[in-house]
Interface confidence: low
Protein backbone atom coordinates (compact mmCIF):
# COMPACT_ATOMS: atom_id res chain seq x y z
CA UNK A 1 0.00 0.00 0.00
CA UNK A 2 0.98 3.74 -0.45
CA UNK A 3 0.19 6.89 1.41
CA UNK A 4 -1.87 10.10 -0.54
CA UNK A 5 -1.71 13.07 0.49
CA UNK A 6 -0.60 16.79 -1.59
CA UNK A 7 2.92 18.47 -1.55
CA UNK A 8 1.48 21.82 -0.67
CA UNK A 9 -1.67 23.25 0.65
CA UNK A 10 -2.99 26.31 -0.12
CA UNK A 11 -5.91 28.14 2.44
CA UNK A 12 -6.56 31.46 2.76
CA UNK A 13 -5.83 33.42 6.19
CA UNK A 14 -9.03 32.35 8.47
CA UNK A 15 -10.11 29.42 5.99
CA UNK A 16 -10.47 25.91 7.27
CA UNK A 17 -7.36 24.04 5.89
CA UNK A 18 -7.82 20.16 4.71
CA UNK A 19 -4.58 18.28 5.46
CA UNK A 20 -4.78 14.76 3.21
CA UNK A 21 -3.49 11.41 4.24
CA UNK A 22 -5.29 8.57 2.37
CA UNK A 23 -3.65 5.14 2.97
CA UNK A 24 -4.38 3.28 -0.79
CA UNK A 25 -3.84 -0.48 0.81
CA UNK A 26 -4.41 -3.78 -0.99
CA UNK A 27 -7.57 -5.51 0.34
CA UNK A 28 -8.29 -7.11 3.74
CA UNK A 29 -5.99 -4.25 5.07
CA UNK A 30 -6.68 -2.05 8.38
CA UNK A 31 -5.43 1.42 9.02
CA UNK A 32 -5.16 0.92 13.23
CA UNK A 33 -4.19 4.63 13.67
CA UNK A 34 -2.69 7.85 12.09
CA UNK A 35 -0.83 10.17 13.97
CA UNK A 36 -0.71 14.25 12.61
CA UNK A 37 2.45 16.25 13.65
CA UNK A 38 4.10 19.68 12.69
CA UNK A 39 7.48 18.83 11.76
CA UNK A 40 8.96 22.48 10.60
CA UNK A 41 12.95 21.86 10.55
CA UNK A 42 14.75 23.66 13.70
CA UNK A 43 12.00 22.86 16.18
CA UNK A 44 11.01 19.58 17.53
CA UNK A 45 7.72 17.89 15.91
CA UNK A 46 4.55 19.17 17.88
CA UNK A 47 1.79 16.49 17.97
CA UNK A 48 -1.26 17.86 16.77
CA UNK A 49 -3.58 14.49 16.94
CA UNK A 50 -4.24 11.39 16.99
CA UNK A 51 -6.96 9.24 15.32
CA UNK A 52 -7.48 6.08 16.61
CA UNK A 53 -10.17 3.10 14.89
CA UNK A 54 -11.48 2.07 17.84
CA UNK A 55 -11.59 5.28 20.27
CA UNK A 56 -11.97 8.19 18.05
CA UNK A 57 -9.87 11.66 17.42
CA UNK A 58 -7.77 12.82 20.73
CA UNK A 59 -6.71 16.27 19.87
CA UNK A 60 -3.52 17.98 21.82
CA UNK A 61 -3.71 20.34 24.00
CA UNK A 62 -1.94 22.95 22.18
CA UNK A 63 -4.35 22.64 18.88
CA UNK A 64 -8.03 22.12 21.22
CA UNK A 65 -10.66 23.28 19.36
CA UNK A 66 -8.62 23.58 15.90
CA UNK A 67 -8.55 20.34 14.66
CA UNK A 68 -11.24 17.75 13.59
CA UNK A 69 -11.87 14.91 11.39
CA UNK A 70 -14.17 15.79 7.81
CA UNK A 71 -17.77 15.32 8.05
CA UNK A 72 -18.96 11.99 7.44
CA UNK A 73 -19.21 10.21 5.71
CA UNK A 74 -15.66 8.87 6.29
CA UNK A 75 -13.92 6.11 5.17
CA UNK A 76 -11.42 3.91 7.47
CA UNK A 77 -8.46 4.68 5.44
CA UNK A 78 -8.73 8.30 5.54
CA UNK A 79 -6.69 9.83 8.00
CA UNK A 80 -7.26 13.67 6.81
CA UNK A 81 -8.08 16.22 9.17
CA UNK A 82 -9.11 19.75 8.99
CA UNK A 83 -7.13 22.63 10.51
CA UNK A 84 -10.02 25.47 11.36
CA UNK A 85 -8.97 29.08 11.01
CA UNK A 86 -5.78 28.89 9.78
CA UNK A 87 -3.35 31.75 10.62
CA UNK A 88 0.20 32.38 9.85
CA UNK A 89 1.94 30.54 12.45
CA UNK A 90 0.29 27.20 10.98
CA UNK A 91 2.53 27.68 8.42
CA UNK A 92 4.82 25.31 7.79
CA UNK A 93 5.40 21.36 7.77
CA UNK A 94 3.04 18.17 8.69
CA UNK A 95 3.62 14.73 8.50
CA UNK A 96 1.08 11.99 8.89
CA UNK A 97 2.53 8.33 10.40
CA UNK A 98 -0.34 5.30 9.36
CA UNK A 99 0.12 2.37 11.69
CA UNK A 100 -1.58 -0.63 9.45
CA UNK A 101 -2.01 -3.56 9.61
CA UNK A 102 -0.69 -6.14 8.56
CA UNK A 103 1.29 -4.01 6.27
CA UNK A 104 3.00 -1.93 8.65
CA UNK A 105 4.07 1.94 8.92
CA UNK A 106 3.80 4.66 6.60
CA UNK A 107 4.58 8.55 6.53
CA UNK A 108 4.38 11.38 4.48
CA UNK A 109 4.62 15.17 4.66
CA UNK A 110 2.85 18.21 3.20
CA UNK A 111 3.31 21.46 2.91
CA UNK A 112 0.64 24.15 4.45
CA UNK A 113 1.02 27.59 2.90
CA UNK A 114 -1.15 30.14 4.24
CA UNK A 115 -2.10 33.06 2.27
CA UNK A 116 -2.39 36.52 3.57
CA UNK A 117 -4.48 38.95 1.54
CA UNK A 118 -3.47 42.65 2.02
CA UNK A 119 -5.33 44.87 3.16
CA UNK A 120 -4.14 48.02 0.69
CA UNK A 121 -4.10 51.18 2.41
CA UNK A 122 -4.25 54.71 -0.07
CA UNK A 123 -2.09 57.77 1.00
CA UNK A 124 -2.96 61.00 -1.09
CA UNK A 125 0.11 63.00 -1.66
CA UNK A 126 0.27 66.75 -0.95
CA UNK A 127 -2.04 69.38 -2.33
CA UNK A 128 -1.65 69.14 -6.04
CA UNK A 129 -0.79 72.48 -7.74
CA UNK A 130 -0.71 73.66 -11.24
CA UNK A 131 2.56 74.76 -11.87
CA UNK A 132 4.51 72.15 -9.61
CA UNK A 133 7.33 70.16 -10.72
CA UNK A 134 6.83 65.92 -10.58
CA UNK A 135 5.01 65.52 -7.52
CA UNK A 136 3.40 62.23 -5.06
CA UNK A 137 0.02 62.47 -6.06
CA UNK A 138 -0.66 59.44 -4.19
CA UNK A 139 0.98 56.18 -1.99
CA UNK A 140 -0.50 52.34 -1.70
CA UNK A 141 0.65 49.62 0.84
CA UNK A 142 -0.51 46.39 0.61
CA UNK A 143 0.96 43.83 3.15
CA UNK A 144 0.20 39.65 2.20
CA UNK A 145 1.87 36.16 2.27
CA UNK A 146 2.69 36.10 -0.39
CA UNK A 147 3.72 39.59 -1.64
CA UNK A 148 0.94 41.18 -3.19
CA UNK A 149 1.19 43.40 -6.33
CA UNK A 150 0.68 46.49 -6.51
CA UNK A 151 0.13 48.68 -10.03
CA UNK A 152 -1.91 51.35 -10.59
CA UNK A 153 -5.17 52.10 -13.20
CA UNK A 154 -5.22 55.59 -14.31
CA UNK A 155 -5.95 57.27 -17.51
CA UNK A 156 -3.69 60.17 -16.16
CA UNK A 157 0.35 60.44 -17.28
CA UNK A 158 2.92 59.64 -14.26
CA UNK A 159 5.83 57.62 -13.17
CA UNK A 160 5.64 54.59 -10.23
CA UNK A 161 8.36 53.48 -8.38
CA UNK A 162 7.68 50.67 -5.89
CA UNK A 163 9.46 49.43 -2.79
CA UNK A 164 9.17 45.95 -0.92
CA UNK A 165 10.14 44.68 2.66
CA UNK A 166 10.19 41.09 3.72
CA UNK A 167 8.75 40.16 7.01
CA UNK A 168 9.62 36.61 8.68
CA UNK A 169 6.25 35.60 7.36
CA UNK A 170 4.65 38.57 4.90
CA UNK A 171 5.75 41.12 2.54
CA UNK A 172 4.59 44.66 2.69
CA UNK A 173 4.69 46.91 -0.67
CA UNK A 174 4.44 50.55 -1.15
CA UNK A 175 3.99 51.76 -4.45
CA UNK A 176 3.86 55.46 -5.37
CA UNK A 177 2.62 57.53 -8.43
CA UNK A 178 4.31 60.97 -9.31
CA UNK A 179 3.18 63.52 -11.63
CA UNK A 180 3.37 66.55 -13.10
CA UNK A 181 -0.09 68.52 -11.70
CA UNK A 182 -1.90 69.87 -14.72
CA UNK A 183 -5.82 71.18 -14.64
CA UNK A 184 -6.64 68.37 -17.12
CA UNK A 185 -6.21 66.16 -14.57
CA UNK A 186 -9.13 67.73 -12.24
CA UNK A 187 -11.71 64.86 -11.21
CA UNK A 188 -9.54 62.23 -13.00
CA UNK A 189 -9.75 58.79 -11.28
CA UNK A 190 -6.24 57.32 -9.73
CA UNK A 191 -7.06 53.39 -8.84
CA UNK A 192 -4.69 51.68 -6.90
CA UNK A 193 -4.65 47.56 -7.52
CA UNK A 194 -3.65 45.16 -5.69
CA UNK A 195 -3.39 41.66 -7.04
CA UNK A 196 -2.42 38.74 -4.79
CA UNK A 197 -3.08 34.74 -4.92
CA UNK A 198 -5.74 35.15 -1.61
CA UNK A 199 -7.52 37.34 -3.63
CA UNK A 200 -10.77 36.47 -5.63
CA UNK A 201 -10.62 39.52 -7.53
CA UNK A 202 -8.17 42.38 -7.65
CA UNK A 203 -8.95 45.05 -4.79
CA UNK A 204 -9.25 48.65 -5.88
CA UNK A 205 -8.98 52.00 -4.46
CA UNK A 206 -9.65 54.90 -6.21
CA UNK A 207 -8.19 58.22 -5.35
CA UNK A 208 -9.85 61.42 -7.48
CA UNK A 209 -7.17 63.85 -8.10
CA UNK A 210 -7.72 67.48 -7.42
CA UNK A 211 -5.24 69.52 -8.66
CA UNK A 212 -5.67 73.51 -7.71
CA UNK A 213 -5.37 76.09 -10.45
CA UNK A 214 -6.63 79.55 -11.94
CA UNK A 215 -7.49 80.21 -15.98
CA UNK A 216 -6.36 83.61 -17.16
CA UNK A 217 -9.27 85.81 -16.58
CA UNK A 218 -11.06 87.12 -20.01
CA UNK A 219 -14.09 89.87 -20.14
CA UNK A 220 -16.79 89.08 -22.75
CA UNK A 221 -19.37 91.81 -23.76
CA UNK A 222 -17.89 94.32 -25.41
CA UNK A 223 -17.72 92.15 -28.68
CA UNK A 224 -19.52 94.67 -30.42
CA UNK A 225 -19.05 98.12 -29.33
CA UNK A 226 -21.57 99.39 -31.27
CA UNK A 227 -24.24 98.43 -28.91
CA UNK A 228 -22.40 100.40 -26.42
CA UNK A 229 -24.65 103.18 -26.75
CA UNK A 230 -26.01 105.94 -25.23
CA UNK A 231 -29.96 104.86 -24.02
CA UNK A 232 -29.16 101.07 -24.12
CA UNK A 233 -30.78 98.90 -21.45
CA UNK A 234 -29.23 95.11 -20.52
CA UNK A 235 -25.60 95.78 -21.20
CA UNK A 236 -23.53 93.38 -19.50
CA UNK A 237 -19.84 92.48 -18.53
CA UNK A 238 -18.97 88.82 -18.01
CA UNK A 239 -15.93 87.84 -16.64
CA UNK A 240 -14.85 84.60 -17.53
CA UNK A 241 -11.95 82.11 -15.98
CA UNK A 242 -12.01 78.46 -13.95
CA UNK A 243 -10.29 77.23 -11.40
CA UNK A 244 -9.95 75.13 -8.43
CA UNK A 245 -11.35 75.33 -5.63
CA UNK A 246 -14.24 77.73 -7.82
CA UNK A 247 -12.82 80.86 -8.05
CA UNK A 248 -14.63 84.48 -6.52
CA UNK A 249 -15.37 87.31 -8.97
CA UNK A 250 -15.15 90.88 -7.71
CA UNK A 251 -15.60 94.04 -9.87
CA UNK A 252 -13.70 97.53 -9.65
CA UNK A 253 -13.82 100.58 -11.55
CA UNK A 254 -10.08 101.69 -12.26
CA UNK A 255 -10.42 105.43 -12.90
CA UNK A 256 -13.17 105.39 -9.84
CA UNK A 257 -16.24 104.34 -8.43
CA UNK A 258 -18.48 102.08 -10.06
CA UNK A 259 -21.69 104.10 -11.08
CA UNK A 260 -24.73 104.09 -9.39
CA UNK A 261 -26.88 101.25 -10.89
CA UNK A 262 -24.57 99.12 -11.95
CA UNK A 263 -25.39 95.56 -10.91
CA UNK A 264 -22.17 93.36 -9.60
CA UNK A 265 -23.68 89.51 -9.19
CA UNK A 266 -20.88 87.15 -9.35
CA UNK A 267 -19.01 86.90 -12.57
CA UNK A 268 -21.65 89.64 -14.02
CA UNK A 269 -21.51 93.18 -14.01
CA UNK A 270 -24.87 94.54 -14.94
CA UNK A 271 -25.90 98.09 -16.28
CA UNK A 272 -28.77 100.34 -16.19
CA UNK A 273 -29.94 101.82 -19.28
CA UNK A 274 -26.02 103.59 -20.80
CA UNK A 275 -25.12 107.28 -19.95
CA UNK A 276 -21.49 108.56 -20.60
CA UNK A 277 -20.68 107.82 -17.17
CA UNK A 278 -20.51 104.56 -17.73
CA UNK A 279 -17.47 104.81 -19.80
CA UNK A 280 -14.49 104.21 -17.83
CA UNK A 281 -12.36 101.37 -17.23
CA UNK A 282 -13.77 98.19 -15.35
CA UNK A 283 -11.38 95.94 -14.07
CA UNK A 284 -12.46 92.10 -12.91
CA UNK A 285 -10.89 90.65 -10.16
CA UNK A 286 -10.89 86.50 -9.91
CA UNK A 287 -9.15 84.82 -7.17
CA UNK A 288 -9.16 81.95 -5.19
CA UNK A 289 -6.92 80.07 -2.51
CA UNK A 290 -4.32 78.84 -4.97
CA UNK A 291 -3.82 82.42 -7.39
CA UNK A 292 -5.65 85.25 -8.57
CA UNK A 293 -5.61 87.18 -11.84
CA UNK A 294 -7.44 90.30 -13.41
CA UNK A 295 -8.66 91.33 -16.45
CA UNK A 296 -9.42 95.02 -17.51
CA UNK A 297 -11.80 96.49 -20.64
CA UNK A 298 -12.11 100.31 -21.50
CA UNK A 299 -15.88 100.93 -21.77
CA UNK A 300 -17.00 103.53 -24.29
CA UNK A 301 -20.39 104.53 -23.79
CA UNK A 302 -21.42 106.34 -27.99
CA UNK A 303 -23.74 109.02 -28.59
CA UNK A 304 -25.90 108.27 -31.29
CA UNK A 305 -25.72 111.83 -32.41
CA UNK A 306 -21.99 111.42 -33.35
CA UNK A 307 -21.32 109.23 -36.86
CA UNK A 308 -17.71 108.59 -36.09
CA UNK A 309 -17.00 105.18 -33.90
CA UNK A 310 -14.78 104.49 -31.55
CA UNK A 311 -12.07 101.82 -30.44
CA UNK A 312 -12.41 99.15 -27.61
CA UNK A 313 -8.92 98.65 -25.78
CA UNK A 314 -9.11 95.41 -24.02
CA UNK A 315 -6.02 94.24 -21.58
CA UNK A 316 -5.66 91.10 -19.57
CA UNK A 317 -2.98 90.71 -16.82
CA UNK A 318 -2.28 88.33 -14.21
CA UNK B 1 0.73 64.99 24.43
CA UNK B 2 2.85 62.24 24.15
CA UNK B 3 5.03 61.19 26.04
CA UNK B 4 7.83 58.19 26.17
CA UNK B 5 9.91 57.78 29.87
CA UNK B 6 12.19 55.35 30.31
CA UNK B 7 13.13 53.14 33.21
CA UNK B 8 15.12 50.57 34.66
CA UNK B 9 18.82 51.42 33.64
CA UNK B 10 21.82 51.56 35.61
CA UNK B 11 25.34 50.20 36.38
CA UNK B 12 25.56 46.38 35.81
CA UNK B 13 28.95 44.14 35.70
CA UNK B 14 29.78 42.15 32.10
CA UNK B 15 27.52 39.16 31.15
CA UNK B 16 24.84 40.25 33.56
CA UNK B 17 21.05 41.43 33.07
CA UNK B 18 18.71 44.61 32.92
CA UNK B 19 15.41 45.19 32.06
CA UNK B 20 14.36 48.61 30.23
CA UNK B 21 11.00 49.99 30.37
CA UNK B 22 9.37 52.74 28.74
CA UNK B 23 5.62 54.26 29.79
CA UNK B 24 3.57 55.67 26.98
CA UNK B 25 0.97 58.12 27.29
CA UNK B 26 -0.84 60.71 24.84
CA UNK B 27 -1.70 58.32 22.09
CA UNK B 28 -3.19 54.65 21.27
CA UNK B 29 -0.18 52.83 21.70
CA UNK B 30 -0.88 49.72 20.29
CA UNK B 31 -1.28 51.68 16.45
CA UNK B 32 2.28 52.85 16.34
CA UNK B 33 5.21 50.38 16.08
CA UNK B 34 8.22 51.56 18.53
CA UNK B 35 11.90 51.28 18.86
CA UNK B 36 14.88 50.99 21.11
CA UNK B 37 18.23 53.32 19.95
CA UNK B 38 21.20 53.59 22.14
CA UNK B 39 24.11 56.69 21.92
CA UNK B 40 27.81 55.48 23.50
CA UNK B 41 29.06 58.06 25.73
CA UNK B 42 30.44 60.81 23.14
CA UNK B 43 28.97 58.51 19.90
CA UNK B 44 26.43 58.71 17.74
CA UNK B 45 22.82 57.15 17.64
CA UNK B 46 22.44 53.51 17.27
CA UNK B 47 19.16 51.19 15.98
CA UNK B 48 18.93 48.46 18.71
CA UNK B 49 15.56 46.99 17.96
CA UNK B 50 12.10 47.78 16.83
CA UNK B 51 8.57 46.10 17.67
CA UNK B 52 5.26 46.19 15.52
CA UNK B 53 1.86 47.65 16.78
CA UNK B 54 0.43 44.72 18.10
CA UNK B 55 3.43 43.02 19.22
CA UNK B 56 3.72 40.07 16.18
CA UNK B 57 6.69 41.41 14.79
CA UNK B 58 10.44 41.95 15.93
CA UNK B 59 13.55 43.67 14.54
CA UNK B 60 17.20 43.64 16.15
CA UNK B 61 20.48 44.95 14.95
CA UNK B 62 23.01 42.49 14.15
CA UNK B 63 25.56 43.45 17.73
CA UNK B 64 22.81 42.42 20.06
CA UNK B 65 21.05 39.89 18.23
CA UNK B 66 20.59 36.77 20.44
CA UNK B 67 20.83 38.98 23.96
CA UNK B 68 18.41 41.33 23.32
CA UNK B 69 14.65 41.19 23.51
CA UNK B 70 11.94 43.83 23.07
CA UNK B 71 8.40 43.21 23.87
CA UNK B 72 5.22 45.18 24.41
CA UNK B 73 2.21 45.38 27.03
CA UNK B 74 -0.33 47.36 24.78
CA UNK B 75 -2.47 46.65 28.09
CA UNK B 76 -0.18 48.47 29.71
CA UNK B 77 1.47 50.62 27.49
CA UNK B 78 5.04 50.24 27.94
CA UNK B 79 7.41 48.89 25.79
CA UNK B 80 10.26 46.57 26.61
CA UNK B 81 13.50 45.79 26.05
CA UNK B 82 15.19 42.92 28.08
CA UNK B 83 19.37 42.72 28.00
CA UNK B 84 21.15 39.92 28.50
CA UNK B 85 24.77 38.85 28.65
CA UNK B 86 25.78 42.57 28.85
CA UNK B 87 29.02 43.51 27.10
CA UNK B 88 31.36 46.84 28.38
CA UNK B 89 30.22 48.10 24.22
CA UNK B 90 26.41 47.69 25.68
CA UNK B 91 27.35 50.99 27.56
CA UNK B 92 25.07 54.34 26.09
CA UNK B 93 21.89 55.73 27.04
CA UNK B 94 19.03 54.00 25.47
CA UNK B 95 16.04 56.12 24.41
CA UNK B 96 12.66 54.60 23.80
CA UNK B 97 10.91 56.14 20.29
CA UNK B 98 7.88 56.27 18.71
CA UNK B 99 7.82 55.00 14.55
CA UNK B 100 6.06 58.05 13.37
CA UNK B 101 3.48 55.72 11.50
CA UNK B 102 2.30 51.72 10.96
CA UNK B 103 0.94 50.58 7.73
CA UNK B 104 -0.12 47.50 9.59
CA UNK B 105 0.03 46.49 13.33
CA UNK B 106 1.72 43.05 13.14
CA UNK B 107 4.33 43.79 10.86
CA UNK B 108 7.27 46.29 11.68
CA UNK B 109 8.08 49.34 8.63
CA UNK B 110 10.74 51.59 9.48
CA UNK B 111 9.99 55.12 9.56
CA UNK B 112 11.26 58.12 11.37
CA UNK B 113 11.27 58.48 14.84
CA UNK B 114 8.84 61.33 15.91
CA UNK B 115 9.05 61.03 19.68
CA UNK B 116 11.91 60.22 21.69
CA UNK B 117 11.82 59.46 25.76
CA UNK B 118 14.35 61.72 28.04
CA UNK B 119 17.03 58.03 27.87
CA UNK B 120 18.35 55.84 30.52
CA UNK B 121 21.52 54.90 31.05
CA UNK B 122 23.29 51.39 31.26
CA UNK B 123 26.76 51.04 32.77
CA UNK B 124 28.20 47.29 31.79
CA UNK B 125 31.71 47.97 34.20
CA UNK B 126 33.17 45.53 36.52
CA UNK C 1 23.39 47.11 6.24
CA UNK C 2 23.04 51.01 4.38
CA UNK C 3 25.52 53.14 5.21
CA UNK C 4 24.71 57.02 5.88
CA UNK C 5 28.15 59.09 5.52
CA UNK C 6 27.78 62.45 6.77
CA UNK C 7 29.59 65.84 5.96
CA UNK C 8 31.24 68.16 7.60
CA UNK C 9 31.93 66.02 10.98
CA UNK C 10 31.61 69.41 12.59
CA UNK C 11 31.40 73.27 11.41
CA UNK C 12 31.83 76.58 12.96
CA UNK C 13 29.15 79.61 12.02
CA UNK C 14 27.52 82.50 13.28
CA UNK C 15 24.24 83.41 14.00
CA UNK C 16 22.34 84.27 10.79
CA UNK C 17 24.52 82.27 8.74
CA UNK C 18 22.94 79.79 5.77
CA UNK C 19 24.33 75.96 6.99
CA UNK C 20 24.25 72.89 4.90
CA UNK C 21 24.99 69.61 5.85
CA UNK C 22 25.09 66.70 3.48
CA UNK C 23 24.30 63.17 3.81
CA UNK C 24 24.68 60.27 1.46
CA UNK C 25 23.60 56.55 1.16
CA UNK C 26 25.51 53.52 0.23
CA UNK C 27 22.69 52.77 -1.72
CA UNK C 28 19.52 54.19 -3.07
CA UNK C 29 17.05 54.69 -1.03
CA UNK C 30 14.04 56.69 -2.78
CA UNK C 31 13.05 59.64 -0.72
CA UNK C 32 13.13 57.59 2.96
CA UNK C 33 15.61 59.92 4.98
CA UNK C 34 14.91 61.88 7.95
CA UNK C 35 16.85 64.40 10.08
CA UNK C 36 17.56 64.63 13.65
CA UNK C 37 18.71 67.61 16.07
CA UNK C 38 20.21 66.55 19.31
CA UNK C 39 21.01 69.03 21.93
CA UNK C 40 23.60 67.85 24.36
CA UNK C 41 22.00 65.99 27.51
CA UNK C 42 18.96 65.92 25.64
CA UNK C 43 16.65 63.35 23.24
CA UNK C 44 16.80 64.05 19.57
CA UNK C 45 14.10 65.60 17.78
CA UNK C 46 12.70 64.99 14.37
CA UNK C 47 13.45 67.87 11.76
CA UNK C 48 12.49 66.78 8.39
CA UNK C 49 11.33 63.22 7.08
CA UNK C 50 10.84 62.10 3.70
CA UNK C 51 13.76 63.86 2.78
CA UNK C 52 11.99 67.48 2.47
CA UNK C 53 9.25 67.24 4.37
CA UNK C 54 8.60 69.52 8.00
CA UNK C 55 7.80 67.94 10.94
CA UNK C 56 4.96 69.45 12.69
CA UNK C 57 6.42 72.28 15.17
CA UNK C 58 9.63 72.86 12.95
CA UNK C 59 10.70 76.53 11.93
CA UNK C 60 10.39 76.69 8.47
CA UNK C 61 14.55 77.89 8.50
CA UNK C 62 15.06 74.12 8.22
CA UNK C 63 14.95 72.29 4.66
CA UNK C 64 15.15 68.98 3.34
CA UNK C 65 16.38 68.22 -0.10
CA UNK C 66 17.68 65.16 -2.14
CA UNK C 67 17.00 61.63 -3.56
CA UNK C 68 18.75 58.34 -4.04
CA UNK C 69 21.94 58.85 -2.88
CA UNK C 70 22.37 62.30 -2.03
CA UNK C 71 20.50 64.81 0.73
CA UNK C 72 20.90 67.89 2.04
CA UNK C 73 19.96 69.82 5.33
CA UNK C 74 19.72 73.59 4.90
CA UNK C 75 19.20 76.10 7.99
CA UNK C 76 18.43 79.28 6.23
CA UNK C 77 19.40 81.54 8.66
CA UNK C 78 21.15 80.46 11.85
CA UNK C 79 19.48 80.91 15.22
CA UNK C 80 21.55 80.73 18.61
CA UNK C 81 19.14 77.37 19.45
CA UNK C 82 20.52 75.74 16.77
CA UNK C 83 23.63 75.00 17.45
CA UNK C 84 23.48 71.33 18.32
CA UNK C 85 24.61 68.00 15.91
CA UNK C 86 22.50 67.02 13.42
CA UNK C 87 21.95 63.15 12.11
CA UNK C 88 20.66 61.83 9.28
CA UNK C 89 18.89 58.02 9.24
CA UNK C 90 17.66 56.17 6.26
CA UNK C 91 14.32 54.41 6.61
CA UNK C 92 14.34 52.82 3.54
CA UNK C 93 14.62 49.55 5.02
CA UNK C 94 15.64 47.28 7.81
CA UNK C 95 17.81 48.02 10.14
CA UNK C 96 17.32 51.86 10.00
CA UNK C 97 20.59 53.40 10.20
CA UNK C 98 22.16 56.99 11.09
CA UNK C 99 24.70 58.80 9.70
CA UNK C 100 28.00 59.66 12.49
CA UNK C 101 26.42 63.08 13.03
CA UNK C 102 27.46 66.89 12.53
CA UNK C 103 28.53 69.29 15.00
CA UNK C 104 27.11 72.76 14.32
CA UNK C 105 29.08 74.81 17.10
CA UNK C 106 29.56 78.77 17.20
CA UNK C 107 32.67 80.72 15.39
Known amino acids: GELETSDVVTVVLGQDAKLPCFYRGDSGEQVGQVAWARVDAGEGAQELALLHSKYGLHVSPAYEGRVEQPPPPRNPLDGSVLLRNAVQADEGEYECRVSTFPAGSFQARLRLRVLVPPLPSLNPGPALEEGQGLTLAASCTAEGSPAPSVTWDTEVKGTTSSRSFKHSRSAAVTSEFHLVPSRSMNGQPLTCVVSHPGLLQDQRITHILHVSFLAEASVRGLEDQNLWHIGREGAMLKCLSEGQPPPSYNWTRLDGPLPSGVRVDGDTLGFPPLTTEHSGIYVCHVSNEFSSRDSQVTVDVLDPQEDSGKQVDLVSAS | EVQLVESGGGLVQPGGSLRLSCAAS????????MSWVRQAPGKGLEWVSA????????YYADSVKGRFTISRDNSKNTLYLQMNSLRAEDTAVYYCARDRSDVYSYSYFPTPLDYWGQGTLVTVSS | DIQMTQSPSSLSASVGDRVTITCRASQGISSYLAWYQQKPGKAPKLLIYAASSLQSGVPSRFSGSGSGTDFTLTISSLQPEDFATYYCQQHYTTPPTFGQGTKVEIK
Open chain 2, 51 to 58: ISGSGGST
Open chain 2, 26 to 33: GFTFSSYA
